[in-house]
Amino acid sequence: KFSKQSWGLENEALIVRCPRQGKSSYIVDWYYSQTNKSIPTQERNRVFASGQLLKFLPAEVADSGIYTCIVRSPTFNRTGYANVTIYKKQPDCNVPDYLMYSTVSGSEKNSKIYCPTIDLYNWTAPLEWFKNCQALQGSRYKAHKSFLVIDNVMTDDAGDYTCKFIHNENGANYSVTATRSFTVKDEQGFSRFPVIRAPAHNETKEVEIGENTNLTCSACFGKGAQFLAAVQWQLNGNKITDFSEPRIQQEEGQNQSFSDGLACVNTVLRIADVKEEDLLLRYDCLALNLHGLRRHTIRLSRKNPIDHQS
């Protein structure tokens, strides 16, 4: 219920806020969920708790897992869960879906791109901005506080924008990057029956027990701004929110605009620590708009170990 997905890259700083709210004066205790072991508050540790924040300075792939925070208010102990995944740095320029923050849309009049999660960090201006991994240069781009402003936005300004900044903790510096898609609103548009791009209907995905896996539900609904366009995952025909399994979390739907100008939305289902029982579930990708509902089903199967024959 009070669970939040957070992700980062190895060797970068990652700071996570407890999903349970409370006043800054409240004591917050953090634990490793699996072991119930308390996370230290001493800053000399690489991973330490600081009130409502959990800090990985820097993060390692092995830090991935579920963390429990307990906010001790005068009335209740409010429990929340932070589902943290640390990924290896990508060797190429491509930023995979699972590292993307929510998409923002811009137009000629409003072209602000905020750097995601930056408010959690102790950073100083200026931010560095990249588009599709290329450093942004030219007078059209203005890095202002925690956002980027693009003058005279054009359709080819759409793409993936990465902000890079330095987090300072007690004199030590740590790099942080965050990427989100930027789409340019097209005034001319239309709506049509949803087309699911992924997964294919009745697809089977091979997974390894104990590993993490992501399922992307991606659908397109027409061109331009859409009045109603939603994608979501269901488990055995039930909403994710009704399926009380903290290992399985659905990201908020993220808007995307492809080169063909189609308005698409995708949502990622993150499954942590895949278990045998997950293979028995039916995973439905649902796409809905005013024209109707389309459903594609995917199932998980165990990845067969490669036979080593002499």
Epitope: G22, K23, P74, T75, F76
Partner: antibody, heavy 119, light 106 residues
């Protein structure tokens, strides 16, 4: 919009019990604590206790332990307060109140239930 | 229990006048909330976290204080401000309220 609809006025005999209800609408019931407050001309506003509808956890003012029992029904988004062994000093106006979970203050109040204990 | 003492119990003011009411806590609290109640109505959130105005509260209201001493000030009283104002602490269980300051207009 957020609404807390409390049950109607009650007239009960001393020694009896009564259950007051508070139906929530306009928000996700399980995301916010529900608190109960008593108001009388003599003692003013007194905090009775609270319930976390998601977990069923409760917290009480020591003064009202044994007097008030708080419950919540997630399916109907309704909070309940049972008052037992009623006496004349339990005659009061009772409020159910939602709490703003960012700042911990009472952001939405029910319209009140007046309880009169009299033989 | 933390006892909150509000003063004065009754405050009489003329429209346009500046008024201040205080709330003293028997031990230190981190912040104070204030509520406004008019006869026959439920209390309404007025000021939260010592100094933040709740939604719809006119800018002539302000709150301040720390530790054991807090206050609510109205820079220029208007007729609609006539009500009882309660302070409330959330720093320890049980949560407690002050007895209220009743603001009357002359």
């Amino acid at each position: 919009q957020v609404q807390l609809q409390q049950s109607g006025a009650e007239l009960v005999r001393p020694g009896a019990s009564v259950t007051l209800s508070c139906k929530a609408s306009g928000y996700t019931f399980t995301d916010y604590e529900m608190h109960w407050v008593k108001q009388t001309p003599v003692l003013g506003l007194e905090w009775i206790g609270a319930i976390d509808p998601e977990t069923g956890d409760t917290a009480y003012n020591q003064k009202f332990k044994g007097k008030a029992t708080l419950t919540a029904d997630k399916s109907s988004s309704t909070a309940y307060m049972e008052l037992s062994s009623l006496a004349s000093e339990d005659s009061a106006v009772y409020y159910c109140i939602r709490v703003d979970s960012n700042y911990d203050y009472f952001d939405y109040w029910g319209q009140d239930t007046t309880l009169t204990v009299s033989s | 229990d933390i006892v909150l003492t509000q003063s004065p119990p009754i405050l009489s003011a003329s429209p346009g006048e500046k008024v201040t009411m205080t709330c003293r806590a028997s031990s230190s609290v981190s912040y104070m909330h204030w509520y406004q109640q008019k006869p026959g109505s439920s209390p309404k959130p007025w000021i939260y976290d010592t100094s933040n105005l709740a939604s719809g509260v006119p800018a002539r209201f302000s709150g301040s204080g720390s530790g054991t001493s807090y206050s609510l000030t109205i820079s220029r009283v208007e007729a609609e401000d006539a009500a009882t104002y309660y302070c409330q602490q959330w720093s320890s269980n049980p949560l407690t309220f002050g007895a209220g300051t009743k603001l009357e207009l002359k």
